[in-house]
Interface confidence: medium
């Protein structure tokens, strides 16, 4: 029950996260005009990954798309790529995880297959979340660098007077949406990986155990799972696994391989 809940929650959290990553990628407010000491301006400028916009004091807003690949800063291209990779991985992860959900029965799909699919989708969500966080962070770093470079000469005082900070571009709403969404996708992915570990708990419980129960013939294979049973409570969950099924130790080792993605 806890495994199903963890898996389901991981799926929902990842779904929300990926929807957020898509929203952030499409949003225009990645960088906005910093109005800290320029609160009254006739035109408010802001930019996204795909277009640049301006809002006039009358409320009229117009945007123009970036009709090029070559003419844009390399960093912007890199951020676009990271966000798109994140969305694609996340979308594939969602598709895989739908079939992996324990609460959804698809034909005679075995628990081992569902465990594998859960792990795969979990890893995809983790990488997707990291891509989104990386993309947003690269863009934020670019803004911070530009902000401080532009204001580097703010202390060139004349007659002892210190100049005020210049108006620059600062973090837009899309950055915060992206960070939160990336984080949610990452958390969802971790939950899916945790759920994967609990999908087949019997694996270690019966490892290398062999005994006879009077009146019943029950066989347990070392390194494998219960092959058959006459016990009523278990019959509805009867699954057959081959002796080469992945051990819990192997399952455990998977997430650690992706710690440094």
């Amino acid at each position: 029950m806890a495994v199903t809940a963890c898996q389901g929650l991981g799926f929902v959290v990842s779904l929300i996260g990926i929807a957020g990553i898509i929203a952030a990628t499409c949003m225009d407010q990645w960088s906005t005009q910093d109005l800290y000491n320029n609160p009254v301006t006739a035109v408010f400028n802001y930019q996204g990954l795909w277009r640049s916009c301006v809002r006039e004091s009358s409320g009229f807003t117009e945007c123009r798309g970036y009709f090029t690949l070559l003419g844009l800063p390399a960093m912007l291209q890199a951020v676009r790529a990271l966000m798109i990779v994140g969305i694609v991985l996340g979308a594939i992860g969602l598709l895989v995880s739908i079939f992996a959900l324990k609460c959804i029965r698809i034909g005679s799909m075995e628990d081992s297959a569902k465990a594998n699919m859960t792990l795969t989708s979990g890893i995809m969500f983790i990488v997707s979340g990291l891509c989104a966080i990386a993309g947003v962070s690269v863009f934020a770093n670019m803004l911070v660098t530009n902000f401080w470079m532009s204001t580097a000469n703010m202390y060139t005082g004349m007659g002892g007077m210190v100049q005020t900070v210049q108006t620059r571009y600062t973090f837009g709403a899309a950055l915060f949406v992206g960070w939160v969404a990336g984080g949610l996708t990452l958390i969802g992915g971790v939950m899916m990986c945790i759920a994967c570990r609990g999908l087949a708990p019997e694996e270690t419980n019966y490892k290398a155990v062999s005994y006879h129960a009077s009146g019943h013939s029950v066989a347990y294979k070392p390194g494998g799972f219960k092959a058959s049973t006459g016990f009523g409570s278990n019959t509805k969950n009867k699954k057959i696994y081959d002796g080469g099924a992945r051990t819990e130790d192997e399952v455990q080792s998977y997430p650690s391989k992706h710690d440094y993605v």
Epitope: N45, V54, T68, G71
Partner: antibody, heavy 120, light 106 residues
Framework: QVQLQQSGPELVKPGALVKISCKAS????????INWVKQRPGQGLEWIGW????????KYNEKFKGKATLTADKSSSTAYMQLSSLTSENSAVYFC?????????????WGQGTTVTVSS | QIVLTQSPAIMSASPGEKVTMTCSAS?????MHWYQQKPGTSPKRWIY???KLASGVPARFSGSGSGTSYSLTISSMEAEDAATYYC?????????FGGGTKLEIK
């Protein structure tokens, strides 16, 4: 390298119209706006408007609405400005200049200018 | 519209002298750009986004300011710096230019 090549000088009669061109090369024409700037002899600079070839959108200085019409031909990477109902006030050097992909960016490359003389 | 007032209109400086010209905006703006124009040529982008030097501009030039007050400074005047300098804002429609500061060499 980025270049903006403007058409040659024009001598026109009052009331007539003139169309001057600005051929862009060395960059993606559809990615940056083309601004038009007027400079009367011995005087300062005056912004007429911009056209964004990417989607054909335009923005005019109210003062030049009805006087100037901005167009762009993507296939030839050329921007045009047509001035109508010319008077002596319109005698000036007209520059085309490339803006940035951000609205408030400076104009980084300028054409050599086209001299328009309105005289009967 | 935002009116940009440049001062002084004309100034002269000796080689090696420090030069400062100002541009005052009638309303607060986000960036100021500066262009250099020599007689018979088209303007050149000189300083953009208030303080960034365009490529090829000597390091003796600098720009600063915020809100409504901006300035262009030459730390050590040279003969080739003699030109007219225009400030320009693109923060509000219509975009406007200052009247220009004509810098002459003594």
């Amino acid at each position: 390298q980025v270049q903006l090549q403007q058409s040659g000088p024009e001598l026109v009669k009052p009331g007539a119209l003139v169309k001057i061109s600005c051929k862009a090369s060395g960059y993606t024409f559809t990615s940056y706006d083309i601004n038009w700037v007027k400079q009367r002899p011995g005087q300062g600079l005056e912004w007429i408007g911009w056209i964004y070839p990417g989607d054909g959108s335009t923005k005019y200085n109210e003062k030049f609405k009805g006087k100037a019409t901005l167009t762009a031909d993507k296939s030839s990477s050329t921007a045009y400005m047509q001035l109508s109902s010319l008077t002596s006030e319109n005698s000036a050097v007209y520059f085309c200049a490339r803006g940035g992909y951000r609205y408030d960016e400076a104009m980084d490359y300028w054409g050599q200018g086209t001299t328009v003389t309105v005289s009967s | 519209q935002i009116v940009l007032t440049q001062s002084p209109a004309i100034m002269s400086a000796s080689p090696g002298e420090k030069v400062t010209m100002t541009c005052s905006a009638s309303s607060s703006i986000s960036y100021m750009h500066w262009y250099q124009q020599k007689p018979g040529t088209s303007p050149k982008r000189w300083i953009y986004d208030t303080s960034k030097l365009a490529s090829g501009v000597p390091a003796r030039f600098s720009g600063s300011g915020s809100g409504t007050s901006y300035s262009l400074t030459i730390s050590s005047m040279e003969a080739e710096d003699a030109a007219t300098y225009y400030c320009h804002q693109r923060s509000s429609y219509p975009y406007t230019f200052g009247g220009g500061t004509k810098l002459e060499i003594k």
